[in-house]
């Protein structure tokens, strides 16, 4: 039939509320151009009647609400004067109950689903709300694991939930509700978001930061006992492991028989706007075999290593 | 509508102080972070201060840091930069934004002019 | 202190064309980048936050990618009223800094 076809990724959508999907290809859909939408290859159209549960509304495609049995393979046809481009859409809804299930549980979810908050910023949610114009939003509320959203911290505009000064508690399932009205009639959107916090960001560069060990080697006697401090500045509400490893191995499970290397109790001391932390590694007694091996100090993804290295020989003694 | 009306400007000799003000309307004020950018007259902008939405935090670059002091007043929608020890480079444009998120400066004031010169 | 270089400073385009600028960060800024015109005689507008969000009713052939240290500022189809000045800013770090500036002018 001489249609160009396109293929649109999976939409993972929530059953019994509102869903709206516009057809648009940019360089196809800003001329001239008539939109047609069908299901499953069905040679008819889906009804521009605006009664109807599921209709056409201008380029979108419009389920008031979503069912169950709605999930498959969306077309709309884009024709233009001398083109004709076929857009698959895969839709698949899904039962979710936001205060009932975990969201991990969820296949696949889209990134307006998953959302990412920035360790000590300012930052925000979006609430996506995808619907063509003949849908009225009334005023977005927002739910943290089912409880309404209050605090000097949040502050909601437009469609966004802002967070000052994000801290790791911020984590967790968030929703976001919102009223919307069509041909008179109320359908209630829940968007439910699963909010991780990143910690690349504060009071500099990315975090956390190694002080020391800088990659550097120590000159150390045979059979001498050595501490070695590993130096972290880190944000406040960081959720960071600091330890020590070798080969691949946390110190205290390496040498879990000898104990002759062990790794010492964390300490922090307070700044304005960071923590500085530090962890030793002791060496009861240096042997042979840990002169040349990197000793690494891990901070979340930073990591830098000490190197043992005999002394250079003295040759005034002579 | 939010408005941002800043004051305050003025010419100044080096070593002089000023004190400008910013007064806001059509927003919740104490919601918000709030910064003073300015532009130099080689339309170069340069970010000057920023204090967090409840006072508790206030940010500046070595360059201003000593002599300018940002502050605000919630109660009267207000924000202010007191600024000491001016030098000719601190000639600039000197306009107050509201922070939305970390950067995002989305409402500007219309800025007020310094001129430091002897 | 984080140095933010914005290239080019002047860009000569024609009318419907789509033009790229962009901002290199000398240290990783994560997607703190922030992008705004200036009109002469008017105030800065921002456009773009967190690198890639477009701000409300801030026209869809303007948008922005990039993370880390190298971010491109887009517009595609260029008319009339954006040839103008445009600024990046990096927030990840203080002090935060503006790129130098990009001046666009008609081919």
């Known amino acids: 039939d001489g249609c160009n076809d396109i293929f649109m990724k999976n939409e993972m959508l929530s059953a019994s509320q509102p869903f709206a999907f516009n057809c648009t290809f940019p360089p196809i859909t800003s001329g001239e151009v008539s939109v047609t939408w069908y299901k499953n290859s069905s040679k008819i159209p889906v009804s521009k009647i605006i009664q109807s549960r599921i209709h056409q509304d201008e380029t979108w495609i419009l389920f008031l609400p979503m069912e169950w049995g709605d999930s498959g393979v969306y077309q709309c046809v884009i024709k233009g004067r001398d083109s004709c481009h076929r857009i698959h859409v895969n839709l698949t809804v899904f039962e979710k109950q936001w205060c009932d299930t975990s969201v991990k549980g969820l296949p696949n979810l889209s990134d307006e689903y998953k959302q990412i908050l920035h360790l000590g910023k300012d930052d925000s949610l979006t609430c996506h709300l995808h619907f063509p114009k003949s849908c009225i939003l009334g005023p977005i509320k927002w739910y943290k694991d089912c409880n309404e959203i209050t605090g000097e911290r949040f502050t909601v505009l437009e469609t966004r939930l802002l967070v000052s000064n994000v801290s790791a508690e911020d984590r967790g399932n968030y929703a976001c509700q919102v009223i919307l009205t069509h041909s008179g009639k109320q359908y209630e959107v829940l968007n439910g978001i699963t909010v991780s916090i990143t910690e690349r960001a504060g009071y500099g560069g990315s975090v956390p930061k190694i002080i020391y060990p800088k990659n550097n080697s120590i000159e150390v006697q045979l059979g001498t006992t050595l501490i070695v401090d590993c130096n972290i500045t880190d944000t406040k509400d960081n959720t960071n492991l600091r330890c020590w490893r070798v080969n691949n191995t946390l110190v205290d499970d390496y040498y879990n028989e000898s104990k002759r290397i062990r790794e010492g109790v964390e300490t922090h001391a307070s700044f304005r706007e960071y923590n500085l932390y530090t962890v030793n590694i002791t060496f009861l007694e240096v042997k042979m075999e840990d002169y040349g091996l990197p000793f690494m100090c891990h901070a979340g993804v930073s990591a830098a290593y000490i190197m043992l290295q005999l002394p250079a020989p003295d040759f005034r003694a002579y | 509508e939010v408005m941002l009306v800043e004051s305050g400007g003025g010419l100044v000799k080096p070593g002089g102080s000023l004190k400008l003000s910013c007064a806001a309307s059509?927003?919740?004020?104490?919601?918000?972070?709030m910064s003073w950018i300015r532009q130099t007259p080689e339309k170069r902008l340069e970010w000057v201060a920023t204090?967090?939405?409840?006072?508790?935090?206030?940010y500046y670059p070595d360059s201003v840091k000593g002599r300018f002091t940002i502050s605000r007043d919630n109660a009267n929608n207000t924000l202010y930069l007191q600024m000491r020890s001016l030098r000719s480079e601190d000639t600039a444009m000197y306009y107050c934004?509201?922070?939305?998120?970390?950067?995002?400066?989305?409402?500007w004031g219309q800025g007020t002019l310094v001129t430091v010169s002897a | 202190e984080i140095k933010m270089t914005q290239s080019p400073s002047s860009l000569s385009a024609s009318l419907g064309d789509t033009i790229t600028i962009t901002c290199r960060a000398s240290?990783?800024?994560?997607?703190?980048l922030t992008w705004y015109q200036q009109k002469p005689g008017n105030i800065p507008k921002l456009l773009i936050y967190?690198?890639?969000n477009l701000h409300t009713g801030v026209p869809p052939r303007f948008s922005g990618s990039g993370s880390g240290t190298d971010f491109t500022f887009t517009i595609s189809s260029l008319q009339p009223e954006d040839i103008t000045t445009y600024y990046c800013l990096q927030s990840q770090s203080y002090p935060w800094t503006f790129g130098g500036g990009t001046k666009l002018e008609i081919k």
């Open positions: 059509g927003i919740t004020f104490s919601r918000f972070a």
């Open positions: 240290q990783d800024i994560s997607v703190w």
């Open positions: 967190k690198a890639s």
């Open positions: 204090i967090s939405s409840g006072d508790m935090y206030t």
């Open positions: 934004a509201i922070m939305i998120t970390t950067g995002e400066h989305a409402y």
